[in-house]
Interface confidence: low
C-alpha cells in the first residue's frame, strides 16, 4: 500500500488552530513535475456534506513530502470530508477523513468502520441533542432509509446492513428530519472487496495474518497497519509518536499524538495514534489496553506488564505477544512428516525453528538420506521464528527415504526426520485410440497404459497435421473422458500424440509415441435438379431444386446457387448452408437481366455436379403501385374491388395482379391476373361465406410493379363452401401466377 | 390515511407463475422498507421477503430463496413479487405490509390475497 | 415449523386479565425486541406492541407487553368481547436475516 497518512488535529477549542496534514513517505512525493511523481492534494471534499461557503482554506506545502490545510474560521467549516491524494501512476491514491461536529444532534459511536464482503455493517448514531423528530439516514448524499424518533435504543440509532458488498461503500449520515445537516452523525463505511481474511481478483489468495489491528488490502495482499506499528503483518511496535510504514515519521508537539486522528489507505480508514481513543483522541488507554483507539489487550501472562503504545513488555525469560512464550531450547516447528516431489526437480525445503538464543540462518541444516549436508541458501526471520530455505539439487530416485532438519544454537538442539518420496512423472506406453471420425473431427480416447506414478492430474493431447512443422496443437482434457478434436481439415492426416503429468511441480512427463489419424471427407456424387423459379420482384428470385432419392445419409454440408450475367461477365454465388435446403431466395438482383442459374451440392470443400443450367430473364423494374384499393361485399361468395391507375407510368400497363389470402390463414395467397388493364374494378367470386379476406394487387409493363395497401373485406352470410377465388369467370388456375 | 392494496392472486398449477402486486398511498413510500408475509390456510404467518426504499437490498426466507423475487417501482408507488416454481406449500393469504425502522415492526398491513397453487 | 413457540390457545371472561407467552432463543428473542399482532377473524394482521412493550397510537393500554431473555409476553386486562382473536408473536433473527413469527395463540372470549 502507499505510505499515505492524513493526519487531523482535533484540539476543537479554537477552530483556527484545525489544521489537516497529509504525509507521504513514498520517494520523491509531494514534489510536482520535476520530480518523480504529480504532488500531493490535500482538499475539502463538497459533494456529499455540503457546508456554507466561507473565506477559502490556505494550503501548505512543508518540504517534498507533506501539505498542510489551515484558515477555517467557524467550527462549521471542518464538517464534512476531506481527502488527501498521494502516489503515482497505478499507486495514485485517495485517504479520506470524515469530520463530526462535536456539537451535533446525533455523533456516531465509531466514524470509520471496515467490513469484509458479506458481513453486517451495524452503524450507531448516538444521540447528543435530542429532537422528537424521524431520522434520516443517507448514503452518500442519497435518501437511504427513515427510523421513527421513538425508535432509538439505547439512546442509539442503529442502521443496519447485512450483506454489505463493495458498491455499499461510502460516507452515510444520520439527521434529524429539519435539522441542519451540520448537526448529522457523518460515517464512513469500507466494503473490503473480499471475504475475512483473503485477497486477489477471485478471493482466491490467504491473507498474512495482519497483526495489531491491521487490515489486509483486498488488492494486493499487503497489511495496512495502523499508526504506530510496522512490518509485513504489523507485528512490530513503533516507538511512542512515531508513525508511517518504516516509523519513520514523528508526531508534531511535545504531547506527542495525543489529539490527532490518523488516516491511511482504504481498507484501513482513521483511528487515533497507537495509545489514545476517543471522539478527539486524547483519552489514554485505560490499563490493560493498547494500540491505535486502545483496541488491543494486552493480556500478559508470566509477570509481563502492558505498555498502552507497543503491548506486553515481557521479562527476562519470556517473550511472545502475551509473553507466552518461555525462551528455551531450540525446537523445530511444524515440519511435516511426509513430502513428495517430482523426479528431477528442485524444490526448495523449508524449516522453522525457535528458541533463545535466536537460531539463525547457519545454525539450520538439512541433512539427505545418504549423509549429505544442505546448507539454507535464505532465512526469514520473523519475531518467533527463523525459517530457513534449503534449494535442493536435482533430485535422483536415490534421494527417496528419510531426511533430516537439525537445528542446533547455544542453548541446544532439535531435529526433525521426515519423509520425502520422489515420484517418476509417467509416460505413456501407447498411442491414443481413434473412436470415431468426421470430415472436420476426431473423436481420440486419449487414457493409456503408463510408466511412472501416478495420480494422472492432467492429459495433454498434441496433435499436427501429418508431415507439417507447424506447431503443435495441445488440449487439456480430463483423463476419464473422450476427446474431440474440432475444426480439422476435412481429408487430413493428423500426428497424434498424449502427454501425462502427475501433481506438483515438474510432474509433465515425456510425450508418447505418435499415431496417424486421417479425417474424412466423401466427394459429394449427387446432381440437384432445378424444379423451378418464379420471380418475387424485380431483383428477386425464388429458386427451387430436388435431389435424387438414394439410401443413406445424405453425403453433402449444403448447396452452391451459381447466376452467370453473362452481359456484364459477372458470377453471383449463393451459399445455402443446410444440405436439408430445396429453395432460396435471391435477392438484390438487376432487373431486366438474363441470367443463367445452376445448383450443386457440396460436402467439405468438395463440389457435387452441377445441375443442368436454367435461364431466367428477370423482369425491368415495374410501375408503382395502384391506389386508393377498395374492397367491397357484394354476397355471401363475391367481393368487388375499386381501384385508380398508378401515377406516373412508364408505359401502358399490360396487366394488374390481385393478390387473395385468407385474413390469419396459414396457406400460401393465391395471385388472379386481370387481364384487362384499363379496367378500375373487379369481382373476386367463388369466396367462402362469412370469411375474412385480405387483398393487394399490383401492375405489370414489362415486369412487376409494387403492392398497393392491403385491404380487408368478409363476404356476407352463410353459404356453400367454394371451390375457391376466380375473378369474373375466368377460373383462378387460369390466372395463377406461377 | 396509509392504505395497501394487494392484487394478481389465483389459482396455477405447480411449477407455474404468479407476479403479486402491492399499490400503497397515503405516505411517502420511497421512504420505507417493504415486506411480503403469508398465512397457509389455518396456520401462523410466515415471513417471505423484505425489500429496502431504494430497491437495492433485497432478502427472502430459506423457503422461497430462488424462487421468488422482490421488486418495487418508488415512481408508482407499487411492490412487487415475481413467483415461480410455485409449489403446493406455497398456498396462502399474501399480505404485503409496511417496515417500522429499527423496531422493524410492521406497521400497516393490506388485506391480502389469495394463491392457491393446486393440479 | 415456527421459530417462535406460543400456545395454540387461551381464553378469558370478560373483564378478566389473560397473558399469552411467547419463547424464542438467543438469535431472535435474545437479541431483538418483539412485536405483537392482533388477527382479528378474516381480517389481516394489525401491529399491536412494538419493541417489546410500546403501543401504537390507538392502541388501549389494557394491552401491554414484556421481554425477558428469551421469551416475551403480551397480556390483556379487562377483557373485552372485541379481543377474541389471534395474537402472533414476531422478533428478527440475526441468523436468518428476517423475522420470525409464532404459530399464533386463537384467544377466545367466553
Known amino acids: 500500500a502507499v505510505d499515505l497518512t492524513l493526519l487531523a488535529n482535533l484540539r476543537l477549542t479554537d477552530p483556527q488552530r484545525f489544521f489537516l496534514t497529509c504525509v507521504s513517505g513514498e520517494a520523491g512525493a509531494g514534489r510536482g513535475s520535476d520530480a518523480w511523481g504529480p504532488p500531493l492534494l490535500l482538499e475539502k471534499d463538497d459533494r456529499i456534506v455540503r457546508t456554507p461557503p466561507g473565506p477559502p482554506l490556505r494550503l501548505a506545502r512543508n518540504g517534498s513530502h507533506q501539505v498542510t490545510l489551515r484558515g477555517f474560521s467557524k467550527p462549521s467549516d471542518l464538517v464534512g470530508v476531506f481527502s488527501c491524494v498521494g502516489g503515482a501512476g497505478a499507486r495514485r491514491t485517495r485517504v479520506i477523513y470524515v469530520h463530526n461536529s462535536p456539537g451535533a444532534h446525533l455523533l456516531p459511536d465509531k466514524v470509520t468502520h471496515t467490513v469484509n464482503k458479506g458481513d453486517t455493517a451495524v452503524l450507531s448514531a448516538r444521540v447528543h441533542k435530542e429532537k422528537q423528530t424521524d431520522v434520516i439516514w443517507k448514503s452518500n448524499g442519497s435518501y437511504f432509509y427513515t427510523l421513527d424518533w421513538h425508535e432509538a435504543q439505547d439512546g442509539r440509532f442503529l442502521l443496519q446492513l447485512p450483506n454489505v458488498q463493495p458498491p455499499s461503500s461510502g460516507i452515510y449520515s444520520a439527521t434529524y428530519l429539519e435539522a441542519s445537516p451540520l448537526g448529522s452523525a457523518f460515517f464512513r463505511l469500507i466494503v473490503r472487496g473480499c471475504g475475512a481474511g483473503r485477497w486477489g481478483p477471485g478471493c482466491t489468495k490467504e491473507c498474512p495474518g495482519c497483526l495489531h489491528g491491521g487490515v489486509c488490502h483486498d488488492h494486493d495482499g499487503e497489511c495496512v497497519c495502523p499508526p504506530g506499528f510496522t512490518g509485513t503483518r504489523c507485528e512490530q511496535a513503533c516507538r511512542e509518536g512515531r508513525f508511517g510504514q518504516s516509523c519513520q515519521e514523528q508526531c508534531p508537539g511535545i504531547s506527542g499524538c495525543r489529539g490527532l486522528t490518523f488516516c491511511l489507505p482504504d481498507p484501513y480508514g482513521c483511528s487515533c495514534g497507537s495509545g489514545w481513543r476517543g471522539s478527539q483522541c486524547q483519552e489514554a488507554c485505560a490499563p490493560g489496553h493498547f494500540g491505535a483507539d486502545c483496541r488491543l489487550q494486552c493480556q500478559c501472562q508470566n509477570g509481563g506488564t502492558c505498555d498502552r503504545f507497543s503491548g506486553c513488555v515481557c521479562p527476562s525469560g519470556w517473550h511472545g505477544v502475551h509473553c507466552e512464550k518461555s525462551d528455551r531450547i531450540p525446537q523445530i516447528l511444524n515440519m511435516a512428516s511426509e513430502l513428495e516431489f517430482n523426479l528431477e526437480t528442485m524444490p526448495r525445503i523449508n524449516c522453522a525453528a525457535a528458541g533463545n538464543p535466536f537460531p539463525v540462518r547457519g545454525s539450520i541444516e538439512l541433512r539427505k538420506p545418504d549423509g549429505t549436508v544442505l546448507l539454507s541458501t535464505k532465512a526469514i526471520v520473523e519475531p518467533e521464528k527463523t525459517t530457513a530455505e534449503f534449494e535442493v539439487p536435482r533430485l535422483v530416485l536415490a534421494d527417496s527415504g528419510f531426511w533430516e532438519c537439525r537445528v542446533s544454537t547455544s542453548g541446544g538442539q532439535d531435529s526433525r526426520r521426515f519423509k520425502v518420496n520422489v515420484k517418476v512423472p509417467p509416460v505413456p506406453l501407447a498411442a491414443p485410440r481413434l473412436l470415431t471420425k468426421q470430415s472436420r473431427q476426431l473423436v481420440v480416447s486419449p487414457l493409456v497404459s503408463f510408466s511412472g506414478d501416478g495420480p494422472i492430474s492432467t492429459v495433454r493431447l498434441h496433435y499436427r497435421p501429418q508431415d507439417s512443422t507447424m506447431d503443435w496443437s495441445t488440449i487439456v482434457v480430463d483423463p476419464s473422458e473422450n476427446v474431440t478434436l474440432m475444426n480439422l481439415r476435412p481429408k487430413t492426416g493428423y500426428s497424434v500424440r498424449v502427454q501425462l503429468s502427475r501433481p506438483g511441480e515438474g510432474g509433465e512427463g515425456a510425450w508418447g509415441p505418435p499415431t496417424l489419424m486421417t479425417t474424412d471427407c466423401p466427394e459429394p456424387l449427387l446432381q440437384p435438379w432445378l424444379e423451378g423459379w418464379h420471380v418475387e420482384g424485380t431483383d428477386r428470385l425464388r429458386v427451387s431444386w430436388s435431389l435424387p432419392l438414394v439410401p443413406g445419409p445424405l453425403v453433402g454440408d449444403g448447396f452452391l446457387l451459381r447466376l452467370w450475367d453473362g452481359t456484364r461477365g459477372q458470377e453471383r454465388r449463393e451459399n445455402v448452408s443446410s444440405p436439408q435446403a430445396r429453395t432460396a431466395l435471391l435477392t438484390g438482383l438487376t432487373p431486366g437481366t438474363h441470367y443463367q442459374l445452376d445448383v450443386q451440392l457440396y460436402h467439405c470443400t468438395l463440389l457435387g455436379p452441377a445441375s443442368p443450367p436454367a435461364h431466367v430473364l428477370l423482369p425491368p423494374s415495374g410501375p408503382p403501385a395502384p391506389r386508393h384499393l377498395h374492397a367491397q361485399a357484394l354476397s355471401d361468395s363475391e367481393i368487388q374491388l375499386t381501384w385508380k391507375h398508378p401515377e406516373a407510368l412508364p408505359g401502358p400497363i399490360s396487366k394488374y395482379v390481385v393478390e387473395v389470402q385468407v385474413a390469419g390463414g396459414a396457406g400460401d395467397p393465391l395471385w388472379i391476373d386481370v387481364d384487362r388493364p384499363e379496367e378500375t374494378s373487379t369481382i373476386i367470386r367463388g369466396l367462402n361465406a362469412s370469411t375474412r379476406y385480405l387483398f393487394r394487387m399490383r401492375a405489370s409493363i414489362q415486369g412487376l410493379g409494387d403492392w398497393s395497401n392491403t385491404v380487408e373485406e368478409s363476404t356476407l352470410g352463410n353459404g356453400l363452401q367454394a371451390e375457391g377465388p376466380v375473378q369474373e369467370s375466368r377460373a383462378a388456375e387460369e390466372g395463377l401466377d406461377q | 390515511e396509509v392504505q395497501l392494496l394487494e392484487s394478481g392472486g389465483g389459482l396455477v398449477q405447480p411449477g407455474g407463475s404468479l407476479r403479486l402486486s402491492c399499490a400503497a398511498s397515503?405516505?411517502?413510500?420511497?421512504?420505507?422498507?417493504m415486506q411480503w408475509v403469508r398465512q397457509a390456510p389455518g396456520k401462523g404467518l410466515e415471513w417471505v421477503s423484505s425489500?429496502?426504499?431504494?430497491?437495492?437490498?433485497?432478502y427472502y426466507a430459506d423457503s422461497v430463496k430462488g424462487r421468488f423475487t422482490i421488486s418495487r417501482d418508488n415512481s408508482k408507488n407499487t411492490l412487487y413479487l415475481q413467483m415461480n416454481s410455485l409449489r403446493a406449500e406455497d398456498t396462502a393469504v399474501y399480505y404485503c405490509?409496511?417496515?417500522?425502522?429499527?423496531?422493524?415492526?410492521?406497521?400497516?398491513w393490506g388485506q391480502g390475497t389469495l394463491v392457491t397453487v393446486s393440479s | 415449523q415456527y421459530e417462535l413457540t406460543q400456545p395454540p390457545s387461551a381464553s378469558g371472561t370478560p373483564g378478566q386479565r389473560v397473558t399469552i407467552s411467547c419463547s424464542g432463543s438467543?438469535?431472535?428473542?435474545?437479541?431483538?425486541?418483539v412485536n405483537w399482532y392482533q388477527q382479528l377473524p378474516g381480517t389481516a394482521p394489525k401491529l399491536l406492541i412494538y419493541?417489546?412493550?410500546q403501543r401504537p397510537s390507538g392502541v388501549p393500554d389494557r394491552f401491554s407487553g414484556s421481554k425477558s431473555a428469551t421469551s416475551a409476553s403480551l397480556a390483556i386486562s379487562g377483557l373485552q368481547s372485541e379481543d377474541e382473536a389471534d395474537y402472533h408473536c414476531?422478533?428478527?433473527?440475526?441468523?436468518?436475516?428476517?423475522?420470525?413469527f409464532g404459530g399464533g395463540t386463537k384467544l377466545t372470549v367466553l
Open positions: 438467543s438469535s431472535n428473542i435474545g437479541s431483538n425486541n
Open positions: 405490509a409496511r417496515g417500522r425502522g429499527t423496531t422493524r415492526a410492521f406497521d400497516y
Open positions: 397515503g405516505f411517502t413510500f420511497s421512504r420505507y422498507k
Open positions: 425489500i429496502y426504499p431504494s430497491g437495492g437490498i433485497t
Open positions: 419493541s417489546n412493550d
Open positions: 414476531a422478533a428478527w433473527d440475526d441468523s436468518l436475516n428476517g423475522p420470525v
